[in-house]
């Protein structure tokens, strides 16, 4: 297993609709034909997998149908979008990239992106 550098932004603020997007960039040593991208969430020293997708050359990045993630890939960059976020989902989101093919296998883990989610204030009732 060989190490690989992965870069991602330090901080991202989710939109009022609970959507956060960030770019995950990896330093590929060659042209990879199969890349696996996993988003991990670290909170209170617990790490959980948020979503994962394998990108095969000639195809787009496809997450499972029920995934809260979507993404596109361009060269050595993956543009990730996480939806349906609420204030309780605030945490460090780590991008893990694995170059599955061709051999050798490379693994890179980013430092994480702190995503802040603020639940929108409910609209006050208005009298007309």
């Amino acid at each position: 297993c060989k190490a690989m550098h992965v870069a991602q932004p330090a901080v991202v603020l989710a939109s009022s609709r609970g959507i956060a997007s960030f770019v995950c960039e990896y330093a590929s040593p060659g042209k990879a034909t199969e890349v696996r991208v996993t988003v991990l969430r670290q909170a209170d020293s617990q790490v959980t997998e948020v979503c994962a997708a394998t990108y095969m050359m000639g195809n787009e990045l496809t997450f499972l149908d029920d995934s809260i993630c979507t993404g596109t890939s361009s060269g050595n960059q993956v543009n990730l979008t996480i939806q349906g976020l609420r204030a309780m989902d605030t945490g460090l989101y780590i991008c893990k990239v694995e170059l599955m093919y061709p051999p050798p296998y490379y693994l890179g883990i980013g430092n994480g992106t702190q995503i802040y989610v603020i639940d929108p204030e409910p609209c006050p009732d208005s009298d007309f």
Epitope: C1, T33, E34, R36, M56, M57, G58, N59, E98, M100, Y101, P102, P103, P104, Y105, L107
Partner: antibody, heavy 118, light 110 residues
Framework: QMQLVQSGAEVKKPGASVTVSCKAS????????IHWVRQAPGQGLEWVGR????????IFSQKLQGRVSMTRDTSMSTHYLTLSHLRPEDTAVYYC???????????WGQGTLVTVSS | QPVLTQPPSVSGSPGQSVTISCTGT?????????VSWYQQHPGKAPKLMIY???SRPSGVSNRFSGSKSDNTASLTISGLQAEDEADYYC??????????FGTGTKVTVL
């Protein structure tokens, strides 16, 4: 000299499971990806799946997804293919093969015949 | 399961040349230069003969050559010999699965 030596023939009943082993020698075990390919009697080659020894990550043919698993024992330099809920149509010679890079299989085991019959 | 189409059989006399075709689509053979060819004698494991469309592994006779045009790859055996009688399979990367094999071609030396 790179070598892959597979376990002997197996006869199983429908619904049972079978495990085929593939002992590797002559190369650094974790460096080479391993594939499994099967061939039904008188039929062509069918790709079963691939394992990356250094990570344990596997990818399988959609046809067999859910019934197949691939594992490895690094200390024994051995790969294993397990196929569960066997059906008569799983009767085939199962081969392990090393990945030469660029989607080719450069060294092959001698094959293991698995017969599924009631 | 996608499959690459090969002729069921080809034959030739000793010393002649024979060519086996392997037809796919732009999602496999036509889209990438990851075409391989394997030789399989009865009761034996397959042996890699050609990779990356036209490259030969060390130890494989230069009588075996590979090429590709559009969605079709070809394996040519020149100076046909008795020991070339075997089944031949092509394989290719495909964007839906890492590996797909051809239907296989039986080569008979007359």
């Amino acid at each position: 000299q790179m070598q892959l030596v597979q376990s002997g023939a197996e006869v199983k009943k429908p619904g049972a499971s079978v495990t085929v082993s593939c002992k590797a020698s002559g190369y650094t075990f974790t460096n080479s990806y391993i594939h499994w390919v099967r061939q039904a009697p008188g039929q062509g080659l069918e790709w079963v799946g691939r394992l990356i020894p250094s990570s344990g990550y596997t990818i399988f043919s959609q046809k067999l997804q859910g019934r197949v698993s691939m594992t490895r024992d690094t200390s024994m330099s051995t790969h294993y293919l397990t196929l569960s809920h066997l059906r008569p149509e799983d009767t085939a010679v199962y081969y392990c093969a090393t990945d030469g890079g660029n989607y080719n299989l450069d060294f092959w085991g001698q094959g293991t015949l698995v017969t599924v019959s009631s | 399961q996608p499959v690459l189409t090969q002729p069921p059989s080809v034959s030739g006399s000793p010393g002649q040349s024979v060519t086996i075709s392997c037809t796919g689509t732009s999602s496999d053979v036509g889209g990438y230069n990851y075409v391989s060819w394997y030789q399989q004698h009865p009761g034996k494991a397959p042996k890699l003969m050609i990779y990356d469309v036209s490259s030969r592994p060390s130890g494989v006779s230069n009588r075996f050559s590979g090429s590709k045009s559009d969605n079709t790859a070809s394996l040519t055996i020149s100076g046909l010999q008795a020991e070339d009688e075997a089944d031949y399979y092509c394989s290719s990367y495909t964007s839906s699965s890492p590996y797909v094999f051809g239907t296989g071609t039986k080569v008979t030396v007359l």
